[in-house]
């Protein structure tokens, strides 16, 4: 009674050994083909022929400028990406048999997509706008309008809005208000008044002196009584230090835009970049 099941068990073992159950799944780095598990080809190699009962999987290295980056059963390697210099691209990292070439954009350009298949020039922020965020290899320049108190007079992909010059801190006054495209123009205190008043004062003084001389010459009658020796009329000399000319603090006048600009003593005679433009 015991023999029959035992024979069945033995026969079952023998049958299993001769005809193994076809695997439904294979181990990692293997693949199922013709009811058997074959080894996958390693990265950098492609499949030439599947394994058999008697032979291993046959793989071949990828050719030049080709790659496969995973364990695979591909019969063809992938071509390396071409970083087309005519699309603003350059090679960031060369490809190997196991990795693709990585492209990036030339300086001043950024990728048009995540795959970085082409590039476009960074946008410049026009006058009146400043750079809020400088462009990167993957994002464009972000511009913002210059708020009140700030200006930008150039088209640039790097320049932020600059604050207006503070005339007060330089003991100067605002002569021309700033805009979002121009800086304020500073000048010395009461400059315009001084430019008008000084010549008038000089003129008046000169006229008074001429009148006085004329009166002295004409109105003075000759007399015989002369207890003191007769004094010759004194020649009038106009000294260098008349009111309005200050020897202690010489003034340098610079013609700028056909307007005399008074340069304060002790400060360098340097016209700002803004004024030169």
């Amino acid at each position: 009674m015991v023999r029959l099941p035992l024979q069945c068990v033995l026969w079952g073992c023998l049958l299993t050994a001769v005809h193994p159950e076809p695997p439904t799944a294979c181990r990692e780095k293997q693949y199922l083909i013709n009811s058997q598990c074959c080894s996958l080809c390693q990265p950098g190699q492609k499949l030439v022929s599947d394994c058999t009962e008697f032979t291993e999987t046959e793989c071949l290295p990828c050719g030049e400028s080709e790659f496969l980056d995973t364990w695979n059963r591909e019969t063809h390697c992938h071509q390396h990406k071409y970083c087309d210099p005519n699309l603003g691209l350059r090679v960031q990292q060369k490809g190997t048999s196991e990795t693709d070439t990585i492209c990036t954009c030339e300086e001043g350009w950024h990728c048009t997509s995540e795959a970085c298949e082409s590039c476009v020039l960074h946008r410049s922020c026009s006058p009146g706008f400043g750079v809020k965020q400088i462009a990167t290899g993957v994002s464009d320049t972000i511009c913002e309008p210059c708020p009140v108190g700030f200006f930008s007079n150039v088209s640039s992909a790097f320049e932020k809005c600059h604050p207006w010059t503070s005339c007060e801190t330089k003991d100067l006054v605002v002569q021309q208000a700033g805009t979002n495209k121009t800086d304020v123009v500073c000048g010395p205190q009461d400059r315009l008044r001084a430019l008008v008043v000084i010549p008038i004062i000089f003129g008046i003084l000169f006229a008074i002196l001429l009148v006085l001389v004329f009166i002295k010459k004409v109105a003075k009658k000759p007399t015989n009584k002369a207890p003191h020796p007769k004094q010759e009329p004194q020649e009038i000399n106009f000294p260098d230090d008349l009111p309005g000319s200050n020897t202690a603090a010489p003034v340098q006048e610079t013609l700028h835009g056909c307007q005399p600009v008074t340069q304060e003593d002790g400060k360098e005679s340097r016209i700002s970049v803004q004024e030169r433009q």
Partner: antibody, heavy 117, light 106 residues
Framework: QVQLVQSGGGVVQPGRSLRLSCAAS????????MHWVRQAPGKGLEWVAV????????NYVDSVKGRLAISRDNSKNTLFLQMDSLRPEDTALYFC??????????WGQGTTVTVSS | SYELTQPPSVSVSPGQTASITCSGD??????ASWYQQKPGQSPVLVIF???RRPSGIPERFSGSNSGNTATLTISGTQAMDEADYYC?????????FGGGTKLTVL
């Protein structure tokens, strides 16, 4: 077979203009970027300009910017180089070439440009 | 600006190996191409993408590129290999050529 045939060279006075042509055959012209390369007498090769396959992008060596202009007519499979305000230093043998994997694989026979008064 | 530097001349005996170098800052990060030019002829591409050979170019021509130097190697040099050789690479969207090397087969 794949070939590039050039024409348009000659002798020209300084300040004058010249237009070089490069006729392509044997390949799909519109699928390739194209170059102009020059070689002064007894000197080495100097890259001059490139134009992308659709003509939307072009670039030049600094010494010719603003004077030389590369263009193409894909319907006629032809590449051009318009040369204005020519200088004696532009005297050279000019080659057109096909762009290929960071290099240039097909070259024209060359055309001579002489700038002299 | 970027520059590619080549020796003006290299001499080799027939059957020997000739090596022509091309140096440039971090050239190994760029792809180098090599051209052969014989007198009165147009240049011919012999190596592209550092080490790839166009069809029709003999196997004796090979290339490598690492660090700051790209090298063109001609093994078993023949008299017909006597010519000028130029390296070329891209920088800032412009193509650049080396000054050229005259290979003399003694």
């Amino acid at each position: 077979q794949v070939q590039l045939v050039q024409s348009g060279g000659g002798v020209v006075q300084p300040g004058r203009s010249l237009r070089l042509s490069c006729a392509a055959s044997g390949f799909t012209f519109s699928s390739y970027a194209m170059h102009w390369v020059r070689q002064a007498p007894g000197k080495g090769l100097e890259w001059v300009a490139v134009i992308s396959k659709d003509g939307s992008y072009e670039n030049y060596v600094d010494s010719v910017k603003g004077r030389l202009a590369i263009s193409r007519d894909n319907s006629k499979n032809t590449l051009f180089l318009q040369m204005d305000s020519l200088r004696p230093e532009d005297t050279a043998l000019y080659f057109c070439a096909r762009d290929y994997w960071y290099g240039m694989d097909v070259w024209g026979q060359g055309t001579t440009v002489t700038v002299s008064s | 600006s970027y520059e590619l530097t080549q020796p003006p001349s290299v001499s080799v005996s027939p059957g020997q190996t000739a090596s022509i170098t091309c140096s440039g800052d971090k050239l190994g990060n760029k792809y180098a191409s090599w051209y052969q030019q014989k007198p009165g002829q147009s240049p011919v591409l012999v190596i592209f993408q550092d080490s790839r050979r166009p069809s029709g170019i003999p196997e004796r021509f090979s290339g490598s590129n690492s660090g700051n130097t790209a090298t063109l190697t001609i093994s078993g040099t023949q008299a017909m290999d006597e010519a000028d050789y130029y390296c070329q690479a891209w920088d800032s969207s412009t193509a650049l050529f080396g000054g050229g090397t005259k290979l003399t087969v003694l």
